[in-house]
Each structure stands twice: as structure tokens, then as C-alpha cells.
């Protein structure tokens, strides 16, 4: 149901609605406070609770930290007294917002505490290699919850120059397709930049020792990354896809990319890192299939086949919507989701999975919809639809609010309706309530009017009376009732005499240059304002100030100086504010006989 604006003083309660919440993934760094957000509206006032890893979490009861809890809100901030305090608060949080009408639920918020990054202590042995051979200098940065950036530099903080021969991979390793004596340096340093902590840490320097040789042997290409001949990977719809091929060989191999399964989407593909990286922006379903890289030099080639499967995190086709219902109605909440693999949909009521609820409850789940028939106020609830596959989770809260509202008639009382005999009158009675009120029309004797077949009701409460008669004049009563109350308004109907043209204009043939007179007489109801006007071929005729073409007076229309253009239909229009009648005549203009 939708409560009309005119229906005043109705219910003041509102089920909880979560208005703000923290993102699904929250990374906190050593110097950060932990702030979890959960805001909700509702009447009566909403109470908030948090769970962490499936148990209630009460921030105020946590020891050794300062907690600020916002009033009328579930949000809180924890400030620690040491740089490592956040570690103990890692976990999966969920906020519940509840009042007497139901419980709304936030999505899961995964809180991750990132420590100060450190490279594990290691002894780095010199890397010895003969000129022309390939080599890989490993970086292996410490793991990070947030993406990090890697740079290779020397001790003078100069970037190692990269080209077709020397390349840093996505994994941070530095690849040499073949080494030159000029690569001989003792200070290859991998730097890892952690934007979250605004920290840059560096690995122990690597000493690359290149032994000179007189006879560099040509080698056909071989892939350093990936090392096998094919690999399968999953790309996420809407996300970028990055494919990489790094080869060794002498002379330095070149890389080409092919798509055997179809054309490469040129508008979305970029090649980086001297063609070693293929980046596909915003992956779509059509990007499924095989991608092949080919490393070539004068001695031969090597290839790798990437078999890409495009999958998708769940997304909404139809998100369940909150609605008000009247008692007895059927509530239907639609939760239609798509994704690859097809997401699994689960329903909750007030935060509790339906499979944990009493089996005798009246809901049923049908093709992704939660349906409750014949709802009653006790069925008011907040439902949650959760859809998940391996790539993500969607959550929607939607309430079913079953309201009982007394019947009210929104049409003004004591309205007067006027209509003429023989016409149809419409008496309005717009009623609203929950359950939807029944509407009945009664006459002055309290008898239903529907015994007379000329009286017909509309679904919106309006009463129609056709073929009006003089004795239909009187008072009518509209009664609207539901299980809480009944209300009445009165409507006055006055049936007036219909306007009639007693003598209408007559069709005639007149000579060009002459004049013609049409006459019209009509009878009107004495209590109504009468009017007689004339029309010529559908347009209103008036006496024009600067022309004596038309003369209109006392139901007479005189047309002077007739011309062929005056030929046509002329109508007398007799009207009141309630009705209009028209009588038509035809004028034919003929010329004088020829000489």
C-alpha cells in the first residue's frame, strides 16, 4: 500500500533502515584508530549491536583501549595505546540495528590490521652468470593487504633501466633475457613501497657478477614467466585482466600477442612493458577464451597459451524493496541476482537465516522471492537477501511493514454535485485505510442505492448514476469501513433540466452578395446561466468590431454580403455550465446566372 499524502496523523513507527556502514574490507595501519561505522534510522529509536567472528562484540568492554561510541548510532572508534593494538581487533564484524518492528543487518566488514612491513632477514649470495645467459633477480616482498609498488634501483637511488632485454615482472622479480658485461653491479636493490603505511622498505642488495666470454652462443627463446606451456585463469567481469609473458634468449626475443578464438578487442587492449604485458580494461563475457603470447628471435620461438574464463561477482537484477502492506495482503520480496558461477541466495528474517526459523512460519520461498500471504501486523519484519559466489557477496535489507490504519474518507464532506437530466453524475468518495476499507453508498433512507441498475460503483469509491431523473435529487451517504472503524460523508445531488434547442437553424441556398438569417431558440433550466453562441465550420463566430459581416443578437445570426467562401455548416450552440447542445444547418451560396 501507499499512504496518500492527504491521509494525516497515521502511524509514527518505522522499521530500522541502515543508512551508513563501513566498507566490506577495512585495512588499518599501525598508527590508525579503528573506526567502524553503522548508522540506522527507525522509530522507536534503534538499538545497535555488533558481532565479531560470530560472537557479540561490545567495544565499551574492551580493555586497554579508549572507545568513543556515538550516541544514537552504532558507530565506534577505538584508539590504542601502542602501535600493535589493532592486531587483536582483526576479524569479521557485523552490525545489527533493531527496534520493535524488526532487525536490519549490515554487510560483513572484514577488518584487517597491517603491521609495519619488514623484509625477512636474509643472506643474499652473489649471483654469478656468464655473459649472454639469462638471469632472474628475485624480490619476494613481504605480503600486504593493500597493493604495493615495487622499484628496482641501485645504491645511488637510480632506477634500473628497463627495455626489451631487462624487465620487472608483475611479481616484482627482475628478468634479464640475456646479460651483458655492463649489467655487472653489486647493488641491485628491490624497493617495496607500501602506500597505506607510507613506508618504503628495501631488500638486501644483490651482487650480479657477469663473466665475460668471447663466444656468445645464440639461443632460441624460452619463457621465464610463465614457465609452463599453458595456464588457466579466471578474469572478473568489469575488472582489468593482465597477462604477462617474459622470455629469455639471444638475440633478445620480441613478444607478440594473438587471440586464436577471435579478434583482439583493440579499443580495450593496451600493451605495456615492451609488449610483455597485455592489459585488457573492463573485462566482459565476450573476452572469454584463449590468449597466446609468442616470443620470437632469429633462432625460433616459444609460446604460452592463457585460457581465460570470465566470471562475475554477484550483481542485482532485482533488489528487494521495502513496502507497507495492509492486513490480508500478500507481500512479495524479489531477490533476483546474477553472477558466474550463479550465486547462491539465502534469506534471513530479522537477521536470522530462514533455515533456523520455525518451519510453521507463513513465508515461502519461490524462484528467488520471499512470499507471505495474508499478512498481519505481527508479520512486520526486516528481511535480508544475501547472494554469494566465490567472488563476492551482496546483501539487501527490505522490510515488510504491516500497518493497521483506521478508515478515512479523503473526499470533503457535504459536497454538492449538479448534473442535468439524462446525463451521468459522479459522486466522489476516496477512502483509505489498512485493511483497505469497503465503500458503500446509501440514500437518505439508509438503503443501498445499488438496487437501481442506473447506479454503479467504481473501485476507487466513486458512485456513478446514469440516465439522471429529476427525482434523483437529494442527499447520498458514502460509508467507508474496515476492521477498526467506519466513517461517513454526505453528498448532495441536484438534478437540473437539460438544455434543449426548441427551434434550430434551417439549411438554405442563398445568392452570392445577398444576406442570410439563421434563428435558434432554446429552453434552459431557470437556475442555470444560459448561453447561445454560433459556430461556422467548427470555429466560433463573433461580431468583429471593424466588420459588419456577422450580426448576432437574440438567437439570430445574420451573415451579410455572402460569398462562396461563406458556404459551409453553421451551428447554434446552447449551453449552461452543466451541458451543451448543438443544432446544425448547411449554407450553400450560388452565383447569379451568367450574362
Amino acid at each position: 500500500i501507499q499512504i496518500p499524502e492527504e491521509y494525516e496523523g497515521h502511524h509514527v513507527m518505522e522499521p530500522p533502515v541502515i543508512t551508513e556502514q563501513s566498507p566490506r574490507r577495512l585495512v588499518v595501519f599501525p598508527t590508525d584508530d579503528i573506526s567502524l561505522k553503522c548508522e540506522a534510522s527507525g522509530k522507536p529509536e534503534v538499538q545497535f549491536r555488533w558481532t565479531r567472528d560470530g560472537v557479540h562484540f561490545k567495544p565499551k568492554e574492551e580493555l586497554g583501549v579508549t572507545v568513543y561510541q556515538s550516541p544514537h548510532s552504532g558507530s565506534f572508534t577505538i584508539t590504542g595505546n601502542n602501535s600493535n593494538f589493532a592486531q587483536r581487533f582483526q576479524g569479521i564484524y557485523r552490525c545489527f540495528a533493531s527496534n520493535k518492528l524488526g532487525t536490519a543487518m549490515s554487510h560483513e566488514i572484514r577488518l584487517m590490521a597491517e603491521g609495519a612491513p619488514k623484509w625477512p632477514k636474509e643472506t643474499v649470495k652473489p649471483v654469478e652468470v656468464e655473459e649472454g645467459e639469462s638471469v632472474v633477480l628475485p624480490c619476494n616482498p613481504p605480503p600486504s593487504a593493500e597493493p604495493l609498488r615495487i622499484y628496482w634501483m641501485n645504491s645511488k637511488i637510480l632506477h634500473i633501466k628497463q627495455d626489451e632485454r631487462v624487465t620487472m615482472g608483475q611479481n616484482g622479480n627482475l628478468y634479464f633475457a640475456n646479460v651483458l658485461t655492463s649489467d655487472n653491479h653489486s647493488d641491485y636493490i628491490c624497493h617495496a613501497h607500501f602506500p597505506g603505511t607510507r613506508t618504503i622498505i628495501q631488500k638486501e642488495p644483490i651482487d650480479l657478477r657477469v663473466k665475460a666470454t668471447n663466444s656468445m652462443i645464440d639461443r632460441k627463446p624460452r619463457l621465464l614467466f610463465p614457465t609452463n606451456s599453458s595456464s588457466h585463469l579466471v578474469a572478473l567481469q568489469g575488472q582489468p585482466l593482465v597477462l604477462e609473458c617474459i622470455a629469455e634468449g639471444f638475440p633478445t626475443p620480441t613478444i607478440k600477442w594473438l587471440r586464436p578464438s577471435g579478434p583482439m578487442p583493440a579499443d580495450r587492449v593496451t600493451y605495456q612493458n615492451h609488449n610483455k604485458t597485455l592489459q585488457l580494461l573492463k573485462v566482459g563475457e565476450e573476452d572469454d577464451g584463449e590468449y597466446r603470447c609468442l616470443a620470437e628471435n632469429s633462432l625460433g620461438s616459444a609460446r604460452h597459451a592463457y585460457y581465460v574464463t570470465v566470471e562475475a561477482a554477484p550483481y542485482w537484477l532485482h533488489k528487494p524493496q521495502s513496502h507497507l502492506y495492509g492486513p490480508g495482503e500478500t507481500a512479495r520480496l524479489d531477490c533476483q541476482v546474477q553472477g558466474r558461477p550463479q550465486p547462491e541466495v539465502t534469506w534471513r528474517i530479522n537477521g536470522i537465516p530462514v533455515e533456523e526459523l520455525a518451519k510453521d512460519q507463513k513465508y515461502r520461498i519461490q524462484r528467488g522471492a520471499l512470499i507471505l500471504s495474508n499478512v498481519q501486523p505481527s508479520d512486520t519484519m526486516v528481511t535480508q537477501c544475501e547472494a554469494r559466489n566465490r567472488h563476492g557477496l551482496l546483501l539487501a535489507n527490505a522490510y515488510i511493514y504491516v500497518v493497521q490504519l483506521p478508515a478515512k474518507i479523503l473526499t470533503a464532506d457535504n459536497q454538492t454535485y449538479m448534473a442535468v437530466q439524462g446525463s451521468t453524475a459522479y459522486l466522489l468518495c476516496k477512502a483509505f485505510g489498512a485493511p483497505v476499507p469497503s465503500v458503500q453508498w446509501l440514500d437518505e433512507d439508509g438503503t443501498t442505492v445499488l438496487q437501481d441498475e442506473r447506479f454503479f460503483p467504481y473501485a476507487n469509491g466513486t458512485l456513478g448514476i446514469r440516465d439522471l431523473q429529476a427525482n434523483d435529487t437529494g442527499r447520498y451517504f458514502c460509508l467507508a469501513a474496515n476492521d477498526q472503524n467506519n466513517v461517513t460523508i454526505m453528498a448532495n445531488l441536484k438534478v437540473k433540466d437539460a438544455t434543449q434547442i426548441t427551434q434550430g437553424p434551417r439549411s438554405t441556398i442563398e445568392k452570392k452578395g445577398s444576406r442570410v438569417t439563421f434563428t435558434c431558440q432554446a429552453s434552459f433550466d431557470p437556475s442555470l446561466q444560459p448561453s447561445i453562441t454560433w459556430r461556422g465550420d467548427g470555429r466560433d463566430l463573433q461580431e468583429l468590431g471593424d466588420s459588419d459581416k456577422y450580426f448576432i443578437e437574440d438567437g439570430r445570426l445574420v451573415i451579410h454580403s455572402l460569398d462562396y467562401s461563406d458556404q459551409g455548416n453553421y451551428s447554434c450552440v446552447a449551453s449552461t455550465e452543466l451541458d451543451v447542445v448543438e443544432s446544425r444547418a448547411q449554407l450553400l451560396v450560388v452565383g447569379s446566372p451568367g450574362p
Epitope: R49, R52, D53, G54, V55, H56, F57, F96, N350, E356
Partner: antibody, heavy 120, light 107 residues
Framework: EVQLVESGGGLVQPGGSLRLSCAAS????????MNWVRQAPGKGLEWVSA????????YYADSVKGRFTISRDNSKNTLYLQMNSLRAEDTAVYYC?????????????WGQGTLVTVSS | DIQMTQSPSSLSASVGDRVTITCRAS??????LNWYQQKPGKAPKLLIY???SLQSGVPSRFSGSGSGTDFTLTISSLQPEDFATYYC?????????FGQGTKVEIK
């Protein structure tokens, strides 16, 4: 079918140790907190310990703190209770219970129990 | 710790009787109160959670009410299978605590 099956109970001397296990099936074990509750012969129920879904949060009753250790292995869908320095008053049937926590919290599934007898 | 006190500790009643058991908390626990039924040699079974919500599969003759510190479990028409011991439990804060139990016996 949602099920919890305890094992590992038996007769043990005072000061001894015992490890109870609780095998879960029919629900996503890693989503729920779990509890141990005990009942001494002819007595009422006494809550012993709780562990959150990931094992990050643990609670004990004062009567067992420092002697009992609750743990879980989500890959094996199993809950454990390591009981050390056992006393005669620890004699009881030990139940494991699944805890459902939403706005409210309750133990909605219980195992059949395993009897621990501490006696010399 | 929050203490839970149940009364009576035992009662005798006949099939068809209306039975009421009360539980009082030593401090306000909102509506964080659960009721369990236990039969001899069996594990407890959840009847009512959140003071008044009926657990799945529990007959509607069981009902719960109350909030704050005072709570009631009512069996509207006692059936032969209802003779058992009933426990209340608070889940407001750890340590979770149970009442001492009420044994319902056949008169």
C-alpha cells in the same frame, strides 16, 4: 541434518588431562561460535567456555580458567576442549553447543554429551 | 557475573494444566534470555530465544515473555511429553549463566 557428536570422555585421575572433541556436520561450522557446557551428576547446567568462529575470541568460566583450553579446527569441522589439572568437581557430562548470534544469541544445537569422571 | 534465579525449583502439574516458570536476572539483560528443556539422559533443547521467540519445531503451547530482569516461560496446556527440567540462560554477557532449573513433574 545438523549434528554435533562429542568424544574423548572417560575416567581420569585428579591432576590428569583429557582432550574432548566435538565433530560438527550439517552446517557451515566456520560461520558459528561454539561452546562447551557441562552438567555435574544430578545438578544443573554450567557454561564452561566459548570460542568465536575463527578462534580469535575465547571466553572461559572462572572455575576452569588457566586449566582448560578451547580450540577449533575449521578445516576438520571440529571443536576441542583440552582439560588439564582435572579436579573431582570437574566430573560432569560435557556438551558442545552451536551458538547462533544475530541481534540475540542462543545455543540452538547441542551434542549428546560425553561423560568425564575425575576420580582416584 | 550475572546471577539467574529460577522459581519454583520444582512443580507438580497435570496434563492440560497451564504452567508458568519465572526467571529473574541480578541485573538488566534486555531481552537476552533463552529457555531450554532437558529430559533425563538427554541433551538440553532450545525452546525460546530472545525472551519470546519460538525456536523452530517447538510447539506453540510454549511461550515466553519479559524483558529487563523478569522473565516467564508459559506452557498453555501441559502435554505428557512436557514433563522435564526447564532452564533459563542469559546471553547478555560472558560468562553466560543458567538458572538452577525447574523440574516439572506429574501430579
Amino acid at each position: 541434518e545438523v549434528q554435533l557428536v562429542e568424544s574423548g570422555g572417560g575416567l581420569v585421575q585428579p591432576g590428569g588431562s583429557l582432550r574432548l572433541s566435538c565433530a560438527a556436520s550439517g552446517f557451515t561450522f566456520s560461520d558459528y561460535a561454539m561452546n562447551w557446557v557441562r552438567q555435574a551428576p544430578g545438578k544443573g547446567l554450567e557454561w564452561v567456555s566459548a570460542i568465536s568462529s575463527t578462534g580469535s575470541t575465547i571466553y572461559y568460566a572462572d572455575s576452569v580458567k588457566g586449566r582448560f583450553t578451547i580450540s577449533r579446527d575449521n578445516s576438520k569441522n571440529t571443536l576441542y576442549l583440552q582439560m588439564n589439572s582435572l579436579r573431582a568437581e570437574d566430573t560432569a557430562v560435557y556438551y558442545c553447543a552451536k551458538q547462533s548470534t544475530y541481534f540475540y544469541s542462543y545455543f540452538d544445537v547441542w551434542g549428546q554429551g560425553t561423560l568425564v569422571t575425575v576420580s582416584s | 557475573d550475572i546471577q539467574m534465579t529460577q522459581s519454583p525449583s520444582s512443580l507438580s502439574a497435570s496434563v492440560g494444566d497451564r504452567v508458568t516458570i519465572t526467571c529473574r536476572a541480578s541485573q538488566s539483560i534486555s531481552r537476552d534470555l533463552n529457555w531450554y528443556q532437558q529430559k533425563p539422559g538427554k541433551a538440553p533443547k532450545l525452546l525460546i530465544y530472545a525472551a519470546s521467540s519460538l525456536q523452530s519445531g517447538v510447539p506453540s503451547r510454549f511461550s515466553g515473555s519479559g524483558s529487563g530482569t523478569d522473565f516467564t516461560l508459559t506452557i498453555s496446556s501441559l502435554q505428557p511429553e512436557d514433563f522435564a527440567t526447564y532452564y533459563c540462560q542469559q546471553s547478555y554477557s560472558t560468562p553466560y549463566t543458567f538458572g538452577q532449573g525447574t523440574k516439572v513433574e506429574i501430579k
